[in-house]
C-alpha cells in the first residue's frame, strides 16, 4: 500500500507495508524554484513557506487563461514528492519556494539567477542549518547559471537539479551541466529510463545517477486533498532532494562532496538497462538508482571513490580531454579510453594547484576521454611520481619511494603515434605491489598517497584469448581506487572504473582479428582506510 | 518607474569626464567574450547578463552599469538596468539593443556577457 | 468489515473541554492510504468537518476550529481521539468518526468520507 | 472557505417520480463534490462523489451530473427507502458541506 517510487528507495531493512524510514530531514531547509504552490495542500500545508521572491516572463499568448490550479500544478506536485505528509520522501524537511516559473511552466536564467541570489542573500541574514536547493528545471547550456551554481554550491549549499526531458546529453543543458550541482535523471518502477512522448529522459556523464520519474504519485493542486501523478526528470530530482535532506539530518557536517561520494555508493548499482541510452552515451552514464541509505549513521569508515568522465577530447592530433575532481576530493588515479584505440595515454598533472587527470589524443584518432578517480580522504598527502621512458627491454617502472606512501593508480602516457604494435610485450614483474610497470617507450605515473590507515593491494585478472572486455573487481571493504591494463596489449580500448570494478575494454576481436598478442590483463588497484574504519568505531 | 530620459541626461553629464579619459579602462590583454544559448529558441535577444570580473565589488558593479547607459544614451540607444547582482556573481542585468554588445564588451571589470534565454519546468 | 465506534461523555459543561474516542474495528488504522476524520452535526442542522489525522499523527484542522481542536493517534489501541477545548452550547452536535481515504494509493478508493460511525451526542451545557 | 448551498431546502415527493436536487458553490470545486444520504438517527452514506461516479453498492437510479459551481442529484424514480436528507460535500479547499435537502414524502 506505499506508492511503488518510496519503495524503491527505501532499503529492504525500512521495508514493512509503510514507509516509515528515521527522521524526515527536519534538521534542512529545502529551497523550490518553481511555479506557484498550492501551499495549503494536506500534504505540504504548514511545511511549506512561499517566499515574497517572484521573477518569472509573460505568459504566452494572447488568449492564455490563468488558472490557478494549473499554475500551482508542477511546483505543488514536486513539494509533495520531497516533503509531502504521505507521499514524500523526507517528511520532516521544511522548504521555501520562490517562484521562477510562470504558468505555462516557463522562466528565464536571469529569472533563475536573482532567485539563487536571493537564497544566498537569505543565508547569509540568518544562516540555519544544512540547505538544500531543488532546481526542477532546465534551459540551455549557460555559462553564467553554471557559475551561480558553482559559486552557491562554494557556499555550503547542495543543489540538485532536473538531468532534462530532451532524450539528450544533459551537458548540453544547464543548469545540468554544473559539475558542482547534483543532476539526476529518471527512471520508472522497471528501472528502465524513462520515455516521455517521443523524448525521455537525459543522460551522458553529466548524469550523476538516476531516481524515480515516471508516474510519481504527489499533491495535486486541483484540490487540498488531491493527488496527481506526475513523471519528469523534475520528480527524480524531488526524490534526490528529499533523500538528501535525510542525510543531512542525520550527518549535518556532511559536506556537497561526501554527500555526493554517499548518494552515489548507496543507490542500487547496474539495474538500468543501457540499451535505451545511445551507444555512444552508455559508457559515460551512470548505472546508478538513488536509494536511502541502510542507517542514518555509521557510513562514515568507509573510502568512497567515483569516476568523473571529462568531456569528449575531439579528433585532432594533439587534442586532450580533461576530467577533475571536486575541491573536497583526491584524484586517486587517471585513465584514459578511445573507442578508436587511438590514443597516447594519459597523465596527472598538477593545475591551479590541484592535481587532474589529462588523456591525449593519437594520430588518425577520434578523440578520447580522461577518467578520473574522485576519492574522499582526509588528511591525504598524494603525489605523482614519473619516470620517462626507459631504454631497457624491461619496460618503463615507477614507485612510490616515499616511506608511508601507497599506491593508488598507474597511469601511463607515450609520445609515439602506436605504442606497442610493433612491440613485445611487457612482463610485469610479480611481487611487486608498489609499483607501475609500462612500456619502455611510455613515460609511466604512479599516484603515491599518504593519509592516516590507508593500505592498498594489486588484483589482476588476465583472460589469454582476446576478449572485449576484461574485468575485476575489489572485494568487499575495499574500494577500487585505481584502474589499468597491463601494458603490452595494443589493442587496449582503455580503461575505467565502474563502482568497484576496474574495466579494460578492447577493440573488437571479430574485426581485429586475433593478434599475437591476445592477452588483456585489468589491473585494479584496491584500497582501505582502516583509520576511518577504528573512528568510526570509536564514534559509536 | 521614473521618467528614463531624465535619467540619461544626468548620467551622460556625470560620466562624461570619466568616459572621456582611460579611467578603469579594461586590462590589457583580456577579452570579454560573449554567449548565447544554442537553442535558437529559447534565446531572450534583447536582455543581457553582464558578468564582472571575480573580486568586482558592488560599487564597481553598479558604475559600470551607469557607464553603459551612458555611453548607450551618446549613441541614441535606451538601455534599463533590471538588477545589479551581488552576493553570487559580480555583474548586472541589462535591457539593451544586441548593437550595444561589442560596447559592452569593452567595458571595465567585463568578464563576459550571456544573452539572457529560457528555462523550461521539467 | 470496517467498524468504528465513537465513545465519550455526553454532558460537558461550558468553557470545560469535550474528549471523545473513536475505536476501530475489522481493520487496522496503521496504513497510508486512510486519514481518520471526525465530523459534526448540531441538531437539525448540517455536517461540519472538524480535523483529520493519520496514523503517523499527522493532522489537519478546519480553520474556524483549528485554535481548539487537538485530534490524536494511539495506534497500539487501533483508536484515535478528539479534544475540543472551551467548548460552549454552539458545540452541542452529534460528533461523528469516519474514514477518509487519504488518495495516495489510488486502488484505496476515492478520497471522500466512509465508513461512519453511528454518532455520539453531546451536549454542551452547566 | 467554499460555501455550498442546497436548494431546495425540502423536496415533497411520491414514490416512483423523479427527484432533482441542486447544488451550488461559491466558488468552483471542478469536479470535486460528493453526495451523501442521511437517514433519520443513522450516519450519512457516501452516494457519489467526483460530482458523477456511483459508490459501491449504490443503485444505478442515483446519478450526479455538473462541474465548477453547479451540481445535481437526480433520483430518476424515488423508492421509499430513500426519503432523507441529502447533502453536498466539496473537497476543493478542505471539506465543506451543504446545508442539506430534505426529500419528503408528498
Known amino acids: 500500500s506505499i506508492p511503488w517510487n518510496l519503495e524503491r528507495i527505501t532499503p529492504p531493512r525500512y521495508r514493512a507495508d509503510e514507509y516509515q524510514p528515521p527522521d524526515g530531514g527536519s534538521l534542512v531547509e529545502v529551497y523550490l524554484l518553481d511555479t506557484s504552490i498550492q501551499s495549503d495542500h494536506r500534504e505540504i500545508e504548514g511545511r511549506v513557506m512561499v517566499t515574497d521572491f517572484e521573477n518569472v516572463p509573460e505568459e504566452d499568448g494572447t488568449r492564455f487563461h490563468r488558472q490557478a490550479s494549473k499554475c500551482d500544478s508542477h511546483g505543488t506536485h514536486l513539494a509533495g514528492v520531497v516533503s509531502g505528509r504521505d507521499a514524500g520522501v523526507a517528511k520532516g524537511a521544511s522548504m521555501r519556494s520562490l517562484r521562477v516559473l510562470n504558468c505555462q511552466g516557463k522562466g528565464t536564467v536571469s529569472g533563475t539567477l536573482i532567485g539563487l541570489e536571493f537564497i544566498r542573500k537569505s543565508q547569509l541574514v540568518q544562516p540555519v542549518g544544512p540547505l538544500v536547493v531543488l532546481l526542477p528545471l532546465a534551459g540551455g547550456y549557460s555559462r553564467v547559471l553554471n557559475a551561480a551554481c558553482q559559486r552557491l554550491a562554494r557556499a555550503g549549499v547542495v543543489l540538485v537539479t532536473a538531468a532534462g526531458n530532451f532524450r539528450d546529453d544533459a551537458c548540453l543543458y544547464s543548469p545540468a551541466s554544473a559539475p558542482e550541482v547534483i543532476t539526476v535523471g529518471a527512471t520508472n518502477a522497471q528501472d528502465q529510463p524513462v520515455t516521455l512522448g517521443t523524448l525521455g529522459t537525459n543522460f551522458g556523464r553529466c548524469v550523476d545517477l538516476f531516481a524515480p520519474g515516471e508516474d510519481i504519485i504527489g499533491a495535486s493542486s486541483d484540490c487540498s486533498t488531491c493527488f496527481v501523478s506526475q513523471s519528469g526528470t523534475s520528480q527524480a530530482a524531488a526524490h534526490v532532494a528529499g533523500i538528501a535532506a535525510m542525510m543531512l539530518s542525520a550527518e549535518p557536517e556532511l559536506t556537497l562532496a561526501e554527500l555526493r561520494q554517499r548518494l552515489i555508493h548507496f543507490s542500487a548499482k547496474d539495474v538500468i538497462n543501457e540499451a535505451w541510452f545511445p551507444e555512444d552515451q552508455r559508457v559515460l552514464t551512470p548505472n546508478l538508482v538513488a536509494a536511502l541509505p541502510p542507517s542514518t549513521h555509521g557510513a562514515g569508515w568507509q573510502l568512497f571513490c567515483r569516476t568523473v568522465w571529462s568531456a569528449h577530447s575531439g579528433p585532432t592530433r594533439m587534442a586532450t580531454a580533461v576530467a577533475r575532481c571536486a575541491p573536497d576530493e583526491e584524484l586517486l588515479s587517471c585513465s584514459s579510453f578511445s573507442r578508436s584505440g587511438k590514443r597516447r595515454g594519459e597523465r596527472m598533472e598538477a593545475q591551479g594547484g590541484k592535481l587532474v587527470c589529462r588523456a591525449h589524443n593519437a594520430f588518425g584518432g577520434e578523440g578520447v576521454y580522461a577518467i578520473a578517480r574522485c576519492c574522499l580522504l582526509p588528511q591525504a598527502n598524494c603525489s605523482v611520481h614519473t619516470a620517462p621512458p626507459a631504454e631497457a627491454s624491461m619496460g618503463t617502472r615507477v614507485h612510490c619511494h616515499q616511506q608511508g606512501h601507497v599506491l593508488t593508480g598507474c597511469s601511463s602516457h607515450w609520445e609515439v603515434e602506436d605504442l606497442g604494435t610493433h612491440k613485445p610485450p611487457v612482463l610485469r614483474p610479480r611481487g611487486q605491489p608498489n609499483q607501475c610497470v609500462g612500456h619502455r617507450e611510455a613515460s609511466i605515473h604512479a599516484s603515491c598517497c599518504h593519509a592516516p590507515g590507508l593500505e592498498c593491494k594489486v588484483k589482476e585478472h588476465g583472460i589469454p584469448a582476446p576478449q572485449e572486455q576484461v574485468t575485476v573487481a575489489c572485494e568487499e571493504g575495499w574500494t577500487l581506487t585505481g584502474c589499468s591494463a597491463l601494458p603490452g596489449t595494443s589493442h587496449v580500448l582503455g580503461a575505467y572504473a565502474v563502482d568497484n570494478t576496474c574495466v579494460v575494454r578492447s577493440r573488437d576481436v571479430s574485426t581485429t582479428g586475433s593478434t599475437s598478442e591476445g592477452a588483456v590483463t585489468a589491473v585494479a588497484i584496491c584500497c582501505r582506510s582502516r583509520h576511518l574504519a577504528q573512528a568510526s568505531q570509536e564514534l559509536q | 518607474q521614473e521618467d528614463e530620459d531624465g535619467d540619461y541626461e544626468e548620467l551622460v553629464l556625470a560620466l562624461r569626464s570619466e568616459e572621456d579619459g582611460l579611467a578603469e579602462a579594461p586590462e590589457h590583454g583580456t577579452t570579454a567574450t560573449f554567449h548565447r544559448c544554442a537553442k535558437d529558441p529559447w534565446r531572450l535577444p534583447g536582455t543581457y547578463v553582464v558578468v564582472l570580473k571575480e573580486e568586482t565589488h558592488l560599487s564597481q558593479s553598479e558604475r559600470t552599469a551607469r557607464r553603459l547607459q551612458a555611453q548607450a544614451a551618446r549613441r541614441g540607444y535606451l538601455t534599463k538596468i533590471l538588477h545589479v547582482f551581488h552576493g553570487l556573481l559580480p555583474g548586472f542585468l541589462v535591457k539593451m539593443s544586441g548593437d550595444l554588445l561589442e560596447l559592452a564588451l569593452k567595458l571595465p571589470h567585463v568578464d563576459y556577457i550571456e544573452e539572457d534565454s529560457s528555462v523550461f519546468a521539467q | 468489515q470496517l467498524q468504528l465506534q465513537e465513545s465519550g461523555p455526553g454532558l460537558v459543561k461550558p468553557s470545560e473541554t469535550l474528549s471523545l474516542t473513536c475505536t476501530v474495528s475489522g481493520g487496522s488504522i496503521v496504513s497510508s492510504s486512510y486519514y481518520w476524520a471526525w465530523i459534526r452535526q448540531p441538531p437539525g442542522k448540517g455536517l461540519e468537518w472538524i480535523g483529520s489525522i493519520n496514523y503517523k499523527g499527522s493532522t489537519y484542522y478546519n480553520p474556524s476550529l483549528k485554535s481548539r481542536v487537538t485530534i490524536s493517534v494511539d495506534t497500539s489501541k487501533n483508536q484515535f481521539s478528539l479534544k475540543l477545548s472551551s467548548v460552549t452550547a454552539a458545540d452541542t452536535a452529534v460528533y461523528y468518526c469516519?474514514?477518509?481515504?487519504?488518495?495516495?494509493?489510488?486502488?484505496?478508493?476515492?478520497?471522500?468520507?466512509?465508513?461512519w460511525g453511528q454518532g455520539t451526542l453531546v451536549t454542551v451545557s452547566s | 472557505e467554499i460555501v455550498l448551498t442546497q436548494s431546495p431546502a425540502t423536496l415533497s415527493l411520491s414514490p416512483g417520480e423523479r427527484a432533482t436536487l441542486s447544488c451550488r458553490a461559491s466558488q468552483s470545486v471542478s469536479s470535486y463534490l460528493a453526495w451523501y444520504q442521511q437517514k433519520p438517527g443513522q450516519a450519512p452514506r457516501l452516494l457519489i462523489y467526483d460530482a458523477s461516479n456511483r459508490a459501491t453498492g449504490i443503485p444505478a437510479r442515483f446519478s450526479g451530473s455538473g462541474s465548477g459551481t453547479d451540481f445535481t442529484l437526480t433520483i430518476s424514480s424515488l423508492e421509499p427507502e430513500d426519503f432523507a436528507v441529502y447533502y453536498c460535500q466539496q473537497r476543493r479547499n478542505w471539506f465543506t458541506f451543504g446545508g442539506g435537502t430534505k426529500v419528503e414524502i408528498k
Open positions: 469516519a474514514r477518509e481515504n487519504s488518495g495516495v494509493v489510488p486502488a484505496a478508493g476515492p478520497n471522500w468520507f466512509g465508513p
